[in-house]
Amino acid sequence: AFGISGVQKYTRALHDSSITGISPITEYLASLSTYNDQSITFALEDESYEIYVEDLKKDEKKDKVLLSYYESQHPSNESGDGVDGKMLMVTLSPTKDFWLHANNKEHSVELHKCEKPLPDQAFFVLHNMHSNCVSFECKTDPGVFIGVKDNHLALIKVDSSENLCTENILFKLSET
């Protein structure tokens, strides 16, 4: 719709966004599902967590994720439009001390155990590009989003604003 040559132009200098304070502005537990209503589940296997995208059986309990929302300042000299903007960034933690991380080298989404302050790889810029769905863009790699590939979460490069609404990067949050 906007004829932008690549999402880098669309989301500039996310690397340099500073997170305002170290405490989240809000936190809550929600289940995470895909645009097509498959559930994101987490399983402990061989002392490490695996992330799956799957259809749950009827009445099967959905895994919950703690979403922590942070406000990030985006100074006008970086935003490209002369406006000091703010963004929402999130971290996602399905179990104590473990957070979703972007592994940009492997184009994968992994669960890592770590202490606060969390590394930048654990922060995702929140988009709601589609009615009542959200997308998660890597803070460390603008234009790269958490997406679904082969029943797993992966990092997916979105190369134009038209593709921001592609179903495999859209997720639903539900507190039930």
């Epitope: 502005i25 703010k86 929402l88």
Partner: antibody, heavy 121, light 107 residues
Amino acid sequence: QVQLQESGPGLVKPSETLSLTCTVSGFSLSKYGVHWIRQPPGKGLEWIGVLRAGGTISYNSALMSRVTISVDTSKNQFSLKLSSVTAADTAVYYCARDHYYYSSFGGFASWGQGTLVTVSS
Amino acid sequence: DIQMTQSPSSVSASVGDRVTITCLASQTIGAWLAWYQQKPGKSPKLLIYAATRLADGVPSRFSGSGSGTDFTLTISSLQPEDFATYYCQQLNSTPYTFGQGTKVEIK
């Protein structure tokens, strides 16, 4: 400086189409969602729809069959069309911009001054 | 659609009074609630976003609290310029519905 300015005819005949334009400056439509909201005289606010930063559009289901939102990024404008209007569509129409980049969760930080549209023959 | 119910619909108060307005959502909306102030003939002005965050340039006598379904806007010491109508709005899901408004009038 962030600015939004609504423009369009102040009087529309019943059954015709109401057309308004919002011209924006001081920010990019590729980064912020922009909304149409209306307020009938002496009443509360009603959300009409949003043009999101990625170009997708969502509408209030109560108006969906009659409303169209479109954008002309080259002119920094987005538009509202409301068809088959009746006296109940008489209202001040506002455009507004999201507080946050890329999402509407933070409410609407900047508003136009509003334009009164009267539906009458 | 999520219904937003504001109370009271109007309140009469004096300068210096503490004023509390509540907003109830018909289903949980997390922290995604905004409060606006509107004066006659003017556009709404964002006061509070994300339930508790003060918008730029808003005096600290305004504060917001709550999450889930129950939210409150408090004006700790009412000033002459605060007489206006106040609206809550949920931003958890479309359509982004507003409360019906609370008019704060001079006693």
